[in-house]
């Protein structure tokens, strides 16, 4: 966001002072607050950056996070009998990347149109309310997920009921703090219209009193809650994981396990090097530098890193696919085009044609869960 | 180079409206719009409006009802009106150059024109 | 509305002093802020804009400082062309001139 200051505001997140309510005139519109840009912000609300890279960016996003989280949902939801505390998880980041993702489309339309918002205030409410809820619910589900793995390493006990209704009850939880925590991105007044420009803005401007205290100490407070203290707990939990894995004696199936658990680290490693660290980082720079300075010169930085931030709808796929057995068969099986009944045929007939037991360790059943490495 | 020039009537009767007219040139009217400014004989600057390039309208809140501020972009014309005008109106007008951003001043002005309100 | 107060009302210097002109703002108006100068019956002329940023074709013994509240516009050395009225503006929120400053010769 540059601030908008009102005049009696002006804008850059923009600063401004919120009920600007307008009409028209002859060939302009006189407006009764007043949002100003400085030439810097827009520069970046006019210029490429923002009307044909984030575009692209979210187009992307959309293109692959949409069916890999909905075939993802799917697999756990439908396909998967033992429903594990890793599953309940992913199930649950795929979700929360689902109602992200699904409002991409108007977002894109936002950006190729000069960043014109067009579609009243109370859809960009939800739009902003989902695109950080989603980078939250991501961080903390993503936490959960690593301390799981690793406790399922630590103690490799086998499924519990128990366990699974603990996961539920966390992940009710999760998405009750988030639903919480994001109030304020939905009764905030998000749009905003620029005369200099002639485009409402859809949060990329905001007013200047809500920001210049209120914006930095939300978001300071999100940094630290909701990304440090998840962040270090994920760190932890994967340089003990690594240290158990080291230790752990080394057959056949300890190896694959172990290629597989540093797979899922660096996935997620990446994730957190691209999508939650500049953009929680930045987030807190860029509202210092607006309530201090008055605008920000990291502006265009804090654009390109918050679009990153959702590339973690994409990311996270790959994270399903190194964790959860049924979803690795449905991903090949979907990529392959070809069907997991068929697949299971196919198994059927090599099992009773080499009558050994050998070949079950192949069998990708759909019934079953296997969420180790 | 860059010329704002003010013109209309120096004498307006009360209650009658008042018509400015900002002529300029050298500069853009898609890149720039102008601010109405007036100052009372001895006494300081009040902001009167502000018109955008693209035709866009604020009015300082003190003075809203009575102005209207608009373009004309073929004739690089832009025009001030206030209605139902008073002695407190009689002021000296300028009009003054402003490029629409938060960072940028006016800085170029018209020479001014004086307006008397008086019967 | 903010409201931009000038002091002292009026400077009387002699040329070639030092004119120290100050503008202190009600609220925090960040590096929004420009000083004109404005001489009899003459359009006010822009000096100084954005706290620091000398306009084109100003002469360099014009300079501005400060942020937040509380800001300066100095004249190094008094030219005689220098005696004149100067507002600052804030255009942080909205658009306020202050009172204005007279330096006139002593």
């Known amino acids: 966001t540059i601030q908008g200051t009102n005049r009696s505001s002006k804008g850059r997140s923009l600063i401004g002072k919120v009920d600007g309510t307008s009409h028209v005139t002859g060939k302009g519109v006189t407006v009764e607050t007043v949002f100003s840009v400085d030439e810097f912000s827009a520069s970046v609300l006019t210029g490429k950056l923002t009307t044909v890279f984030l575009p692209i960016v979210y187009t992307i996003v959309f293109v692959v996070g949409l069916p890999s989280n909905g075939m993802a949902l799917w697999v756990f939801l439908f396909r998967t009998k033992k429903k594990h505390p890793a599953v309940i998880y992913m199930a649950n980041l795929a979700l929360a990347d689902l109602l992200s993702v699904i409002w991409f489309p108007l977002k894109i339309a936002y950006h190729i149109h000069g960043n014109n918002w067009i579609y009243g205030e109370a859809l960009c409410n939800v739009l902003i309310g989902f695109f950080y809820g989603n980078m939250y619910c991501s961080i903390l589900f993503m936490t959960c997920l690593s301390v799981q793995r690793y406790w399922v390493i630590v103690n490799p006990m086998g499924h519990s009921r128990k366990k699974a209704n603990i996961a539920i009850g966390i992940s009710l939880a999760i998405w009750l703090l988030i639903l919480l925590v994001t109030i304020p991105l939905y009764v905030v007044k998000q749009t905003i219209f620029i005369p200099a420009l002639n485009i409402t803005t859809c949060h990329d401007v905001l007013p200047e009193q809500l920001l210049v205290g209120d914006m930095f100490n939300y978001f300071l407070s999100l940094a630290i809650g909701v990304f440090l203290f998840p962040a270090f707990l994920t760190a932890s939990a994967y340089v003990l994981m690594i240290r158990m894995l080291r230790s752990s004696a080394m057959d056949e199936n300890s190896e694959k396990k172990r290629k597989r658990a540093i797979k899922l680290i660096v996935t997620v490693l990446a994730m957190y090097l691209i999508c939650f660290t500049p953009s929680n980082l930045l987030l807190v720079v860029h509202y210092f530098l607006i309530k201090s300075q008055g605008q920000s010169h990291v502006y265009a930085l804090y654009i390109v890193a918050l679009c990153l931030s959702t590339l973690n709808s994409c990311i996270d796929p790959f994270v399903y696919y190194f964790v959860s057995h049924d979803f690795r068969d449905h991903a090949k099986n979907a990529l392959l085009c070809r069907s997991v009944r068929t697949v299971k045929q196919m198994q059927v007939s090599l099992t009773s044609k080499k009558h050994s037991r050998k070949s079950s360790s192949y069998s990708s059943s759909s019934t079953t869960v296997k969420t180790s490495y | 180079q860059v010329q704002l020039q003010e013109s209309g009537p120096g004498l307006v009767k009360p209650s009658e409206t008042l018509s400015l007219t900002c002529t300029v040139s050298?500069?853009?009217?898609?890149?720039?719009?102008v601010i109405w400014i007036r100052q009372p004989p001895g006494k300081g600057l009040e902001w009167i409006g502000v018109?955008?390039?693209?035709?866009?309208?604020y009015y300082n809140p003190s003075l809203k009802s009575r102005v209207t501020i608009s373009v004309d972009t073929s004739k690089n014309q832009f025009s001030l009106k206030l209605s139902s005008v008073t002695a407190a109106d009689t002021a000296v007008y300028y009009c003054?150059?402003?490029?629409?951003?938060?960072?940028?001043?006016?800085?170029?002005w018209g020479q001014g024109t004086l307006v008397t309100v008086s019967s | 509305e903010i409201v931009l107060t000038q002091s002292p009302a009026t400077l009387s210097l002699s040329p070639g002093e030092r004119a120290t002109l100050s503008c202190k703002a009600s609220q925090n108006i960040y590096k929004y802020l420009d000083w004109y100068q404005q001489k009899p019956g003459q359009a006010p002329r822009l000096l100084i804009y954005?706290?620091?940023s000398l306009h084109t074709g100003i002469p360099a013994r014009f300079s501005g400082s400060g942020s937040g509240r509380d800001f300066t516009l100095t004249i190094s050395s008094l030219e005689p062309e220098d005696f004149a009225v100067y507002y600052c503006l804030q255009h942080n929120s909205g658009w306020t001139f202050g009172g204005g400053t007279k330096v006139e010769i002593k």
């Open positions: 050298g500069f853009s009217l898609n890149s720039y719009g």
């Open positions: 018109i955008w390039g693209n035709g866009n309208t």
């Open positions: 003054a150059r402003w490029r629409g951003y938060k960072d940028y001043p006016f800085d170029y």
């Open positions: 954005n706290t620091n």
